[in-house]
Interface confidence: low
Amino acid sequence: GITIPRNPGCPNSEDKNFPRTVMVNLNIHNRNTNTNPKRSSDYYNRSTSPWNLHRNEDPERYPSVIWEAKCRHLGCINADGNVDYHMNSVPIQQEILVLRREPPHCPNSFRLEKILVSVGCTCVTPIVHHVA
Amino acid sequence: GITIPRNPGCPNSEDKNFPRTVMVNLNIHNRNTNTNPKRSSDYYNRSTSPWNLHRNEDPERYPSVIWEAKCRHLGCINADGNVDYHMNSVPIQQEILVLRREPPHCPNSFRLEKILVSVGCTCVTPIVHHVA
């Protein structure tokens, strides 16, 4: 296993009673220094399983705005530009962490929350169930 | 913008100096009550733009394990099961929030960090640049 030696300069921790509360610095460090976040912004239109992006806003959550992908078609777009229903457009989902204000409307107190978001769509071969 | 009325029962906030530090309850609430997180686990294989999942582990981060998608092919899989290079497999990326232990090795002190992860791949029509 990996041993994490404790840093002697850590803030004092409270006892192990739950729910456990920690200090989080909200001055976000962005590791994506060499990336252009818009570089994949046209994939939703050019994909064979295109999707629309829906804005989900919640002022009690951080980030307050999350974009949800909804596949445009049940099938996928073929070479002729038509929907081929022998294939399926499906959402690619990911669990992400958000911060939820708790108690509500408090600027300095949050709870960690996991939510499932659809990031985009991909085209898959359907699972066909043959009935005897 | 939306004004959030302050709850009188909020914990006392410190002064507004930055970096801003807040209290976060780490007993994660999971909103995905009706979802099976593994339900899309076979899309990576069934997609026309299949991908492999690479494990990225960092004990100084939460979540400590993140899975990164890497597209298997430059092209997409056609109806015959061959790679069609007239189409492109591309990663769908998303910025996510993680918690980074700061100072390092501290169990009760974190900094919010944004990282870009590839969640899966989708098949797109390539942008063709015609040279005069």
Epitope: - | I28, N30, N32, E57, P63
Partner: nanobody
């Protein structure tokens, strides 16, 4: 946790842990152990779909399971060795990739019990 105790090498013990009141729908539950002065070691883990994984040191000897109501976690320990002597803790975290190692890595983000002592003499 309960079920700990003293046993001779080669013997068996069954640990149990009542896990109630958590809000996770997808979760990672499991057992880790610690010897004073040493690092925590993940032993076994089970996720909400029932998939199990084990540390190499206990594979084939220990079995993790939960009851039908998913409120009690068990660790059946067979063929015990002196090196299995430790304080054993059960833990639950909010899902994600579920192995004994990640259960320990992410302990700060879950709940764990007070522990039960297991002593194996040769």
């Amino acid at each position: 946790e309960s079920g700990g105790g003293s046993v001779q090498a080669g013997g068996s013990l069954r640990l149990s842990c009542a896990a109630s009141g958590y809000t996770y729908s997808s979760y990672c539950m499991g057992w880790f152990r610690q010897v004073p002065g040493k690092e925590r070691e993940g032993v076994a883990a089970i996720d909400s779909d029932g998939s199990t994984s084990y540390a190499d040191s206990v594979k084939g000897r220990f079995t993790i399971s939960e009851d039908n109501a998913k409120t009690t976690l068990f660790l059946q320990m067979n063929s015990l060795k002196p090196e299995d002597t430790a304080m054993y803790y059960c833990a639950i975290g909010g899902g994600g990739y579920c192995t004994p190692a990640t259960l320990v890595s992410d302990l700060d983000f879950g709940n764990w019990g007070r522990g039960t002592q297991v002593t194996v003499s040769s």
